[in-house]
């Protein structure tokens, strides 16, 4: 009689993470009697798969049943396939044998691939906000995808980027892969309204990239500009005195009154406008009581944004004579104001 | 549901034989192995050996050859440990298993004069 | 044969505490091969953990395992009360099949 064979059709397997993988084998012969185990890789470090006779095998299930008289077919299916499950799996039968059972022969091995999807791009900027004409990076990861062949690309606002490097770990075979790129953003003042978008292009996707985001108003920070301006006399003896912010990002801000170098005043920015841009206008006003003011004052005003270290702008009120307006000559952006009245 | 339902306690004098019985459900007892595994009192577990009930081949532990016999009725799903010349020291608990994964309840042997 | 020997032969930790339970073959044992059982008194005992890492249905995922060779372990990284028992490692690698004499986990 001729000896048995172990065939395993195929030479490939491709299944998509998650799926079932069907890894067939047929043997040519019921002698000589023994089992059928399934094993992923060769030589010593092989991994038992199958073990149609003992050991536990949750995800794998028989074609047919092992059971039946004369019965040839081996195939097994394994559930749930994850990247981890790719490599070469061989149908080995066993001769019974004392004390342990013999490997008498085995198929020709069927090598199972796993197409797995990237996880979404999470995109992230740096750690400390910054400032127009600052560049600053931000990162694009994805992780858990099979095959290796990728494509990403970066965008600001639609408008794709050039600075960026990209790399895929690991760089020789792996059941999975990962991508990480870096991408330099200039940053400008119309930014608190803008994007950075990751775009991850694979296989498994079939055309609909996934995408991960990141608003660049978690990472950019608008100095505000200040002018100080004198209005006119509301009373015998009282000054108006504004203090407009302008053009600032974000809102986190407190502001200063110092008259010759003393503090007169502090408050915090609530009511505030917000420009077509995504920037703040803020104004502030101070009453001076000139009678109280022998000589001329200075006014300052104040401003710590964000943290930052504070910004000041001054104005000299003369107290000798009470001009019907008086103010300074600061450039001023064209943009409205939130009136906020101090006594 | 997969069940091995093991036969009740012996209590037996030290020379004799006992046989123990393991009934399964859920499943083709021809399938798979059937192991017999012991555990003195306070002690751990040891193997005895196994059966193919398709073909009736076994396999024993050297400390349990020549004393211990494992048979498998495939018409009834029913798989048996025969322990023979018995002494005080196979006082144990004695347990079937399904393929490493799946135990009975145990049956408890005293052997005592 | 293959000689399993585990250690240490009692822990004793509280609830919250990290376990680490050892193994050791007297010669390679196939990570495919080595299965870890929990047995509590009066109970059979019951699959733990299968091919050296992959937990049974329904074991936490507080259980890992891990090991190649001759050295296997088994860690609870957070002991809950219900983990007090005794665990048994186990190799059907070769004839005959061999436990280890058990390691007892208790309540410190």
């Known amino acids: 009689e001729e000896e048995l064979q172990v065939i395993q059709p195929d030479k490939s397997v491709l299944v998509a993470a998650g799926e079932t993988a069907t890894l067939r084998c047929t043997a040519t012969s019921l002698i000589p009697v023994g089992p059928i185990q399934w094993f992923r890789g060769a030589g010593p470090g092989r991994e038992l798969i199958y073990n149609q006779k003992e050991g536990h095998f949750p995800r794998v299930t028989t074609v047919s049943d092992l059971t039946k008289r004369n019965n040839m077919d081996f195939s097994i299916r394994i559930g749930n396939i994850t990247p981890a499950d790719a490599g070469t799996y061989y149908c080995v039968k066993f001769r019974k044998g004392s004390p342990d059972d013999v490997e008498f022969k085995s198929g020709a091995g069927t090598e199972l691939s796993v197409r797995a999807k990237p996880s979404a791009p999470v995109v992230s900027g740096p750690a400390a906000r910054a400032t127009p004409q600052h560049t600053v990076s931000f990162t694009c990861e994805s992780h858990g995808f099979s095959p290796r062949d990728i494509t990403l690309k970066w965008f600001k606002n639609g408008n794709e980027l050039s600075d960026f490097q990209t790399n895929v770990d690991p760089v020789g075979e792996s059941v999975s892969y990962s991508i990480h790129s870096t991408a330099k953003v200039v940053l400008t003042r119309e930014d608190v309204h803008s994007q950075v978008i990751c775009e991850v292009a694979h296989v498994t996707l079939q055309g609909d990239p996934l995408r991960g985001t990141a608003n660049l108003s978690e990472t950019i920070r608008v100095p505000p500009t200040l002018e100080v301006t004198q209005q006119p006399v509301r009373a015998e003896n009282q000054v108006n005195v504004t203090c407009q912010v302008r053009k600032f990002y974000p809102q986190r801000l407190q502001l200063t009154w110092l008259e010759n170098g003393n503090v007169s005043r502090t408050e915090t920015a609530s009511t505030v406008t917000e420009n077509k841009d995504g920037t703040y206008n803020w104004m502030s006003w101070l009453l001076v009581n000139v009678s109280a003011h022998r000589d001329d004052v200075k006014l300052t005003c104040q401003v710590e944004h964000d943290g930052q270290p504070a910004v000041s702008k001054s104005h000299d009120l003369k107290v000798s004579a009470h001009p019907k307006e008086q103010g300074s000559n600061t450039a001023a952006e064209n943009t409205g104001s939130n009136e906020r009245n101090i006594y | 549901e997969v069940q091995l339902v093991q036969s009740g306690a012996e209590v037996k004098k030290p020379g004799a034989t006992v046989k123990i019985s393991c009934k399964v459900s859920?499943?083709?007892?021809?399938?798979?192995?059937m192991h017999w595994v012991q555990q003195a009192p306070g002690k751990g577990l040891e193997w005895i050996g196994r059966?193919?009930?398709?073909?009736?081949?076994?396999k024993y532990a050297p400390k349990f050859q020549g004393r211990v016999t494992i048979t498998a009725d495939t018409s009834t799903d029913t798989a048996y440990m025969e322990l023979s010349s018995l002494r005080s020291e196979d006082t144990a608990v004695y347990y079937c298993?399904?393929?490493?994964?799946?135990w009975g309840q145990g049956t408890l042997v005293t052997v005592s004069s | 044969e293959i000689v399993l020997t585990q250690s240490p032969a009692t822990l004793s930790l509280s609830p919250g505490e990290r376990a680490t339970l050892s193994c050791s073959a007297s010669?390679?044992?196939?990570?495919?091969?080595l299965y870890w059982y929990q047995q509590k008194p009066g109970q059979a005992p019951k699959l733990w953990i299968y091919s050296t890492s992959n937990l049974a249905s329904g074991i936490p995922a507080r259980f890992s395992g891990s090991g190649s060779g001759t050295d296997y372990t088994l860690t609870i990284s957070s002991l809950e009360p219900e983990d007090f028992a005794v665990y048994y490692c186990h190799q059907w690698s070769s004839y005959p099949y061999t436990f280890g004499q058990g390691t007892k986990l208790e309540i410190k």
């Open positions: 010669s390679s044992v196939s990570s495919s091969y």
């Open positions: 859920g499943f083709n007892i021809k399938d798979y192995y």
């Open positions: 059966i193919d009930p398709e073909d009736a081949e076994t």
């Open positions: 298993d399904r393929g490493l994964a799946y």
